[in-house]
C-alpha cells in the first residue's frame, strides 16, 4: 500500500507527528513568574495537534525527541530598560513531574529586547513544560513577536 | 510493504517532503522593503524542493504546517549603528493573496547587528511569504549570515 | 501493512530519523577555536542518534538536508564585555573533508552575551561540523545555555 | 516630512478627565515609540509616559499615581493620553513626542494647553 | 528618578560668544544624555543625542560632552537664533529625567 494512501487513512497521530505553537495569554500573578499561553485556530494561526494545555502550561502526550522553540520579544523595550532592568532572563523548563524537573533553555535580554532560540530534547508523556520570566518587563502579546512550540521529531 | 522500499518507489514530493533554504540575492528599490531571495544548487548550497520562487518570493506550493526559520545579519553594522539607525525591523509574512495577509515574524535589530528566529506556522498551497527589512542598514549577502528557509513539518 | 505497524518493525535509522543534541565539553587548546562537545543519555539530555563524534566533533553517517541548530552563552559576560572584547564571533561549518571545507552559519555577539540560530543544509556522510568561537571571551558549559544539534529533514 | 498633530486646547474642571489625541504622518506609526511630555506654565518638562504603538506596551511615570493612560490606535496612526482626577496643577502644556531603542526624543507634537480651573 | 541639575539657571552672552551650560547627573548614566532647545511658544527641538552626537540639521556649533555624571553643552559662537532655554535629559533610567533647564539670554 502507498505511503501516501496510508497517510490519508490512518489518524495523524498515530504517526507521531505531534506538534504545537502556542501564543501568549498572560503572564502569572506577582511572585509567579510563568507565562501562560493559549492555542487554538479560534486564536489565529496557533494549534495543539497531540499536546494540551494545563492551565496556561504545555503537557506533552507522546513520548520522543522534540524540537522546542521560543520567541519572547519584551513590549516596552530600549537602552534603558535592556541594560538597567538586567537581568530578565527566559527560561523554558520541564516543571512537572517533579522528579523530572530541569531548565532545558535559558536566555538573558542583555541589551536586546528579543529573545529567540530552539533545541532537541527527550520528552515523556505527561511532562509539562513551563516558560519562566524573571525580571520586571512584560512582554509583548503579538502572536508575531511573542510564541512558544514544540515539534515530535523522532521516537 | 516495507517503508523503506516505499520511499525509494515514491518520489519525496508525494511524502510531503517540501523544504527550500534561500540566499539572499538583493534587497529592493526604494519605497520596497522586501528582500529578494534566490536558491539553487548552482548558486551554492540554497534549494528548493516543492516551494518555487516568484520574482524573488517564496510560494507554497503544499498545505501544511510549516516550520519557517530566518536569519539576517547588516552588512555593516556595530552595536551603535544598529540602535542610532532605529528602528531596523525584520517581519515575516504572507504578503499574497491578499485576503491572508499577515505578519508571522517580527525582530528588530535594536543593539544587534544580526537576528535569527523560527516558529510554525499553518500554511497553504498558493502563500507567498515576503520578508521586509525597513530601516536604512543593508543586510549582509553572505550565505552564512543571511538566509530563509522553510520545512513541511505535517498537513 | 500499517505504518504504525512498520515504524516498530524497522530499525528508526532506516527510516532516516538521525538526530544529535550536544553539550559543551570544553574549548580547545591555545589557537584553536574549536568547540569540543560531548553527547550520552549518561551525561544528561544530550544524545546522538545516528551521527557520531569524532574528538569532539560532530561526524555526520547519512546524507541528506539537515537542520542544524546552535546557541551558545558567554561564561561571564555582560553588554559591556561583551562590545569591549569585540568580536566573539561563532561559525558553524564543514571542517572535513577539506575539500568540503565552508562555513554553515555566523553570528557576532557584539552587544548580546547568547547567540542562537538554525538553517538547513545539505549534508552529506563523512561531513564533520566544526563550531569554532574566535575572541577571548569563553563559553558557559550549562547544558541549557550552550548546545548544538542536527536533525535529518529529508534525502 | 514627519508631523504630529495635537488635538486642541482644553478647559476641565478639578476631577474631570480630558483625553488629547496626537495624529501622526510622514513615518511607519508601529515603528516608534510614542512618549507624552508635560509642561507647567514657566516651569520645566515632566516625562509622564510611553507607549509602543506596534504592541500596546506601556511604560509609565510613577509621579502621575495611575491617573495617566496612554493608548494608540494604529488604524487612524494617532496616539492619545488620558488624565483623570485633573487638579489645578495639572495646568500645562502636553506634548507627544516620539522616540527609539533610545529614549531621547526627536519630533514633537505642537503642544495641548490643558486648563482645570473651577 | 535620577535628578538631572542644570546650571546656571540663566546665562547672559553676547552674539558671537561661547556659552557653556552644564548639567549634573545624581547617578551615572554613561552616554544616556540629550538636549534640547526651546523657545517661548515652541515644542523643544533635539540638538544633541548620546551626550555628543549632533542631530541632523543641527549646526556644528553645538557641541556635546560627557559621559558618567558631568554633561557640558557648548554653544561656539552665539547666534541670534540661538537665545532660548535648553533643557538635558537623561535616558539611562527610568522615570525619564529632564534638567530644570538653562535660560540663554542677550547680554
Known amino acids: 500500500q502507498r505511503f501516501a494512501q496510508a497517510q490519508q487513512q490512518l489518524p495523524l497521530e498515530s504517526l507521531g507527528w505531534d506538534v504545537a505553537e502556542l501564543q501568549l495569554n498572560h503572564t502569572g500573578p506577582q511572585q509567579d513568574p510563568r507565562l501562560y499561553w493559549q492555542g487554538g485556530p479560534a486564536l489565529g494561526r496557533s494549534f495543539l495537534h497531540g499536546p494540551e494545555l494545563d492551565k496556561g502550561q504545555l503537557r506533552i502526550h507522546r513520548d520522543g525527541i522534540y524540537m522546542v522553540h521560543i520567541q519572547v520579544t519584551l513590549a516596552i523595550c530600549s537602552s534603558t530598560t535592556a541594560s538597567r532592568h538586567h537581568p530578565t532572563t527566559l527560561a523554558v523548563g520541564i516543571c512537572s513531574p517533579a522528579s523530572r524537573s530541569i531548565s532545558l533553555l535559558r536566555l538573558s535580554f542583555h541589551q536586546g529586547c528579543t529573545i529567540a532560540s530552539q533545541r532537541l530534547t527527550p520528552l515523556a508523556r505527561g511532562d509539562t513544560l513551563c516558560t519562566n520570566l524573571t525580571g520586571t518587563l512584560l512582554p509583548s502579546r503579538n502572536t508575531d513577536e511573542t510564541f512558544f512550540g514544540v515539534q515530535w521529531v523522532r521516537p | 510493504q516495507r517503508f523503506a522500499q516505499a520511499q525509494q518507489q515514491l518520489p519525496l514530493e508525494s511524502l510531503g517532503w517540501d523544504v527550500a533554504e534561500l540566499q539572499l540575492n538583493h534587497t529592493g528599490p526604494q519605497q520596497d522593503p522586501r528582500l529578494y531571495w534566490q536558491g539553487g544548487p548552482a548558486l551554492g548550497r540554497s534549494f528548493l524542493h516543492g516551494p518555487e520562487l516568484d520574482k524573488g518570493q517564496l510560494r507554497i506550493h503544499r498545505d501544511g504546517i510549516y516550520m519557517v526559520h530566518i536569519q539576517v545579519t547588516l552588512a555593516i553594522c556595530s552595536s551603535t549603528t544598529a540602535s542610532r539607525h532605529h528602528p531596523t525591523t525584520l517581519a515575516v509574512g504572507i504578503c499574497s493573496p491578499a485576503s491572508r495577509s499577515i505578519s508571522l515574524l517580527r525582530l528588530s535589530f535594536h543593539q544587534g547587528c544580526t537576528i535569527a528566529s523560527q516558529r510554525l506556522t499553518p500554511l497553504a498551497r498558493g502563500d507567498t511569504l515576503c520578508t521586509n527589512l525597513t530601516g536604512t542598514l543593508l543586510p549582509s549577502r553572505n550565505t552564512d549570515e543571511t538566509f530563509f528557509g522553510v520545512q513541511w513539518v505535517r498537513p | 501493512q500499517r505504518f504504525a505497524q512498520a515504524q516498530q518493525q524497522l530499525p528508526l535509522e532506516s527510516l532516516g530519523w538521525d538526530v544529535a543534541e550536544l553539550q559543551l565539553n570544553h574549548t580547545g587548546p591555545q589557537q584553536d577555536p574549536r568547540l569540543y562537545w560531548q553527547g550520552g543519555p549518561a551525561l544528561g539530555r544530550s544524545f546522538l542518534h545516528g551521527p557520531e563524534l569524532d574528538k569532539g566533533q560532530l561526524r555526520i553517517h547519512r546524507d541528506g538536508i539537515y537542520m542544524v541548530h546552535i546557541q551558545v552563552t558567554l561564561a561571564i559576560c555582560s553588554s559591556t564585555t561583551a562590545s569591549r572584547h569585540h568580536p566573539t564571533t561563532l561559525a558553524v561549518g564543514i571542517c572535513s573533508p577539506a575539500s568540503r571545507s565552508i562555513s554553515l552559519l555566523r553570528l557576532s555577539f557584539h552587544q548580546g552575551c547568547t547567540i542562537a540560530s538554525q538553517r538547513l543544509t545539505p549534508l552529506a556522510r563523512g561531513d564533520t561540523l566544526c563550531t569554532n568561537l574566535t575572541g577571548t571571551l569563553l563559553p558557559s558549559r550549562n547544558t541549557d545555555e550552550t548546545f548544538f544539534g542536527v536533525q535529518w529533514v529529508r534525502p | 516630512e514627519v508631523q504630529l498633530v495635537q488635538s486642541g486646547a482644553e478647559v476641565k474642571k478639578p476631577g474631570a478627565t480630558v483625553k488629547i489625541s496626537c495624529k501622526v504622518s510622514g513615518y511607519t506609526f508601529t515603528d516608534y515609540y510614542m512618549n507624552w511630555v508635560q509642561q507647567a506654565p514657566g516651569k520645566g518638562l515632566e516625562w509622564m509616559g510611553i507607549?509602543?504603538?506596534?504592541?500596546?506596551?506601556?511604560h509609565y511615570n510613577q509621579k502621575f499615581k495611575g491617573r495617566v493612560t496612554i493608548t494608540a490606535d494604529t488604524s487612524t496612526d494617532t496616539a492619545y493620553m488620558e488624565l483623570s482626577s485633573l487638579r489645578s496643577e495639572d495646568t500645562a502644556v502636553y506634548y507627544c513626542?516620539?522616540?527609539?531603542?533610545?529614549?531621547?526624543?526627536?519630533?514633537w507634537g505642537q503642544g495641548t494647553l490643558v486648563t482645570v480651573s473651577s | 528618578e535620577i535628578v538631572m541639575t542644570q546650571s546656571p539657571a540663566t546665562l547672559s552672552v553676547s552674539p558671537g560668544e561661547r556659552a557653556t551650560l552644564s548639567c549634573k547627573a545624581s547617578q551615572n548614566v554613561g552616554t544616556a544624555v540629550a538636549w534640547y532647545q526651546q523657545k517661548p511658544g515652541q515644542a523643544p527641538r533635539l540638538l544633541i543625542y548620546?551626550?555628543?552626537n549632533r542631530y541632523n540639521g543641527i549646526p556644528a556649533r553645538f557641541s556635546g560632552s560627557g559621559p558618567g555624571t558631568d554633561f557640558t553643552l557648548t554653544i561656539s559662537s552665539l547666534q541670534s537664533e540661538d537665545f532660548a532655554v535648553y533643557y538635558c535629559q537623561q535616558y539611562s533610567t527610568y522615570p525619564l529625567t529632564f534638567g530644570g533647564g538653562t535660560k540663554v539670554e542677550i547680554k
Open positions: 548620546s551626550a555628543f
Open positions: 507607549i509602543n504603538p506596534y504592541n500596546g506596551g506601556t
Open positions: 513626542a516620539t522616540s527609539g531603542y533610545d529614549l531621547y526624543f526627536d519630533y
